[in-house]
């Protein structure tokens, strides 16, 4: 006899990286017929939602109108059908950005490189932080962690055309509080013609959408989005 229901999916819209004072919605998708959803923050009950009618709803939303450092952290959700509770969802790391200062980002040997050359990004922030994050825009967003007193190095190794794209870095004051993003650095990787044509660039989006730090393109299936979010957050951890 089944003791628990399958775990729900949890994700943040528009994204798990939220500029301070901006709004975010935490979504929890369970099963049709769920009579109660609970959102937990840092291990404690944070909010409850009881969908009506439960048989026609399989997703609830918890709205945060004004993001701040106190709201940043790890969220999970569970749901109940009758008396039976689900397994808890994966953890959602909700990050507040635009805290304090703006780092600078430079790339070595330069923004235009040849396939096979080794590339290193350098991120610098003079205020008190020792952890840095390098993010590449695009659907398959890459997140790297680096450490240093005022700057960190992010070696990419010998690059291919798959590395081309736009990069930004953040200083991290703790796991869930990040600085403003650096100015973007666009890495252009040239190779022989055959290689270039076989390596499509990550999907991109209009520059103005970076304001909400959407590292994915348009959300397709919610489950895909949730899985992607979880993958990116695992990289952060």
């Amino acid at each position: 006899q089944q003791q628990t229901l399958p775990k729900p999916f949890i994700w943040a819209e528009p994204h798990f990286m939220v500029p301070k004072e901006k709004q975010v919605t935490i979504c929890c998708q369970g099963n049709y017929g769920a009579v109660e959803y609970q959102l937990h923050f840092e291990g404690s009950l944070f909010a409850v939602d009881r969908p009506k009618p439960p048989e026609r709803i399989n997703k609830v939303q918890f709205y945060i109108p004004d993001m701040n450092s106190r709201m940043a952290g790890q969220y999970s959700c569970i749901y109940r059908v009758g008396e039976l509770w689900s397994e808890p969802s994966n953890l959602l790391d909700l990050v507040v950005t635009e805290m304090y200062d703006t780092p600078t980002l430079s790339v070595h040997p330069g923004p235009e490189v040849i396939s096979g050359e080794k590339v290193t990004f350098y991120c610098r922030l003079d205020t008190a932080t020792s952890m840095f994050l390098l993010l590449k825009e695009g659907r398959s967003s890459h997140v790297q962690r680096g450490y240093g007193k005022v700057q960190a190095e992010f070696p990419l190794g010998p690059v291919t055309t798959a590395h081309r794209g736009t990069y930004r870095c953040f200083g991290s004051y703790n796991n869930h509080a990040w600085s403003f993003p650096s100015e973007p650095v666009k890495l252009l990787v040239t190779g022989d013609i055959e290689n270039t044509s076989l390596a499509p660039e990550d999907p991109t989006f209009p520059a103005d959408t970076w304001g909400t730090y959407l590292l994915t393109t348009e959300t397709g299936l919610q489950k895909d989005h949730a899985l992607w979010d979880h993958t990116a957050q695992n990289l952060l951890r």
Epitope: L105, S106, H108, G110, G116, E117, K118, T120, G157, P158
Partner: antibody, heavy 115, light 107 residues
Framework: QVQLQQPGAELVKPGASVKLSCKAS????????MNWVKQRPGQGLEWIGM????????NYNEKFKSQATLTVDKSSSTAYMQLSSLTSEDSAVYYC????????WGQGTTLTVSS | DIQMTQSPSSLSASLGERVTLTCRAS??????LNWLQQEPDGTIKRLIY???SLDSGVPKRFSGSRSGSDYSLTISSLESEDFVDYYC?????????FGSGTKLEIK
């Protein structure tokens, strides 16, 4: 055309400091790394460090970290390297070289440390 | 630090001869390797970047190649102005390091 102008020679006393300059022209100064390289008489080349004028990000060879300080003056498109606590071992030619790929080189400054 | 072992340290050759200089990298540097030429007056000029890309204005008799961790500079037919010093430089990983140099002398 790209040019990196360095003074021909500097003479300083042991224990003193010196600030070597490298004036860039013919390109956007803030867009490229600037490297500094040392060559002792009759010897090979040694990389000291580099600075990115746009971000002030620096990277030093550990060997020179305590002695060399790299800075830039964007208004005059000039890169500087200050060397402190000089000894006769620091007598060498010092080159600046543009870009992470070292594409253009200055003519070098001959530093003589002598009492 | 990455060691760049350059050979030979000196080479005597004749005008019109084909010569090859080699640098071996102690760690993976990808294609992040330059070949530099230094004149007797100290002037340094880059000939090859990214292992095999020829700088503009450099004669086509110069070429660069790679086999594993061995990087080569070949001069297909020596001319009088080629009898100077040559260095390899890896810019893959800091501290960036140079080979010890090859002195090319006329036979």
């Amino acid at each position: 055309q790209v040019q990196l102008q360095q003074p021909g020679a500097e003479l300083v006393k042991p224990g003193a400091s010196v600030k070597l300059s490298c004036k860039a022209s013919g390109y956007t100064f803030t867009s490229y790394w600037m490297n500094w390289v040392k060559q002792r008489p009759g010897q090979g080349l040694e990389w000291i460090g580099m600075i990115h004028p746009n971000s002030d990000i620096t990277n030093y060879n550990e060997k020179f970290k305590s002695q060399a300080t790299l800075t830039v003056d964007k208004s005059s498109s000039t890169a500087y390297m200050q060397l402190s606590s000089l000894t006769s071992e620091d007598s060498a030619v010092y080159y600046c070289a543009r870009h992470g790929r070292f594409d253009y080189w200055g003519q070098g400054t001959t530093l003589t440390v002598s009492s | 630090d990455i060691q760049m072992t350059q050979s030979p340290s000196s080479l005597s050759a004749s005008l019109g001869e084909r010569v090859t200089l080699t640098c071996r990298a102690s760690q993976d540097i990808g294609s992040s390797l330059n070949w530099l030429q230094q004149e007797p007056d100290g002037t340094i000029k880059r000939l090859i970047y990214a292992t095999s890309s020829l700088d503009s204005g450099v004669p086509k008799r110069f070429s660069g190649s790679r086999s594993g961790s061995d990087y080569s500079l070949t001069i297909s037919s020596l001319e009088s102005e080629d009898f100077v010093d040559y260095y390899c430089l890896q810019y893959a990983s800091s501290p960036f390091t140079f080979g010890s140099g090859t002195k090319l002398e006329i036979k």
